[in-house]
């Protein structure tokens, strides 16, 4: 003979427990029905009835199984830095992540909490770590023999062109200027860009001179708040 | 916790020296450029000296040039500032911070993600 199925709600054998997509409900002391994902638990059941389940009403959802007897509410809309990239549904939360230029600066477990703008790096300094999702872009000093002129989250210290004849020496912020039109070796003439998940924001700016070193390994240091820093400018 | 703390500051007469410290502690992250900024009373906060780590590349405040040195000691997680000749006009509260706005190479100092320190007072008298 076949074995029997148990319906629900039913008594589980001692010790033992409830399947899948069933709970124990400890009042009734049955095995009872769990709702589907976009559903809650409307009427608990009893010894004798199921579980009774109902949609989640507009703004709320169950993403999971469950026996809840309200559904969970949506975040709150997406903020005007952020892109809604799922939109709430009866089974789903919304998730919201920064618009392109921008990064997660606190993330949440699902989606953004606080984005921030991707920093530029100033002229005399090229990007060493380009912004990711979640991090920030980090500059560094351009080396001798390399330049960046612009103001930009993802261009990177480029050489200097190579001259027959040095009309203007170049620096960490200028590109040489050879006598010739024709130097021997000339870089392309746009500024060299590190790939990025978000978009550029790059703006050409005035040259300004600044030193010039070899890149070199970093400083281990923790991250913290700043106070408002209004500090003087460079060299 | 996360933090940033200096140490080192004090009362000093005009002319005399004082060496700031500034030790990382907590959840670390590798940071390129270290540096102090000064704030007086009634006046903005302004940049003194930034470093970044292993290159020659210093900045220095035109009004403390030939008298401040920074420095640091990376076994130590530490970074200095020695303050030689030190005049009235040095006097404010010396704040460390990591990786942080113009000086350092960005195009802006708003940025508040970036690690500080709560400060350590100079007081230099004439």
């Known amino acids: 003979l076949p074995a029997q199925v148990a319906f629900t709600p039913y008594a589980p054998e001692p010790g033992g427990t409830c399947r899948l997509r069933e709970y124990y409900d400890q009042t009734a002391q049955m095995c009872c029905s769990k709702c589907p994902p976009g559903q809650h638990a409307k009427v608990f059941c009893t010894k004798t009835s199921d579980t009774v389940c109902d949609s989640c009403e507009d703004s709320t959802y169950t993403q999971l199984w469950n026996w809840v007897p309200e559904c969970l509410s949506c975040g709150s809309r997406c903020s005007s830095d952020q892109v809604e990239t799922q939109a709430c549904t009866r089974e789903q939360n919304r998730i919201c992540t920064c618009r392109p230029g921008w990064y997660c600066a606190l993330t949440k477990q699902e989606g953004c909490r606080l984005c921030a703008p991707l920093r530029k790096c100033r002229p005399g300094f090229g990007v060493a770590r380009p912004g990711t999702e979640t991090s920030d872009v980090v500059c560094k000093p351009c080396a001798p023999g390399t330049f960046s002129n612009t103001t930009s989250s993802t261009d990177i210290c480029r050489p200097h062109q190579i001259c027959n004849v040095v009309a203007v020496p170049g620096n960490a912020s200028m590109d040489a200027v050879c006598t010739s039109t024709s130097p021997t070796r000339s870089m392309a003439p746009g500024p060299v860009h590190l790939p990025q998940p978000v978009s550029t924001r790059s703006q050409h700016t005035q040259p300004t001179p600044a030193p010039s070193t070899a890149p070199g390994t970093s400083f281990l240091l923790p991250v913290g708040p700043s106070p408002p820093a209004e500090g003087s400018t460079g060299d | 916790q996360v933090q940033l703390v200096e140490s080192g500051g004090g009362s000093v007469q005009a002319g005399g020296s004082l060496r700031l410290s500034c030790a990382a502690s907590?959840?670390?992250?590798?940071?390129?450029?270290m540096g102090w900024f000064r704030q007086a009373p009634g006046k903005e906060r302004e940049g003194v000296a930034a470093?970044?780590?292993?290159?020659?590349?210093?900045y220095y405040a035109d009004s403390v040039k030939g008298r401040f040195t920074i420095s640091q000691d990376k076994a130590k997680n530490t970074l200095y500032l020695v303050m030689n000749n030190l005049k009235p006009d040095d006097t404010g509260v010396y704040y460390c911070?990591?990786?942080?706005?113009?000086?350092?190479?960005?195009?802006?100092?708003?940025?508040?993600?970036?690690?500080w320190g709560q400060g350590t007072q100079v007081t230099v008298s004439s």
């Open positions: 907590g959840h670390t992250y590798r940071s390129n450029c």
């Open positions: 911070a990591a990786d942080f706005g113009f000086i350092c190479g960005y195009d802006s100092d708003d940025d508040p993600y970036d690690a």
């Open positions: 470093m970044y780590t292993g290159t020659d590349w210093k």
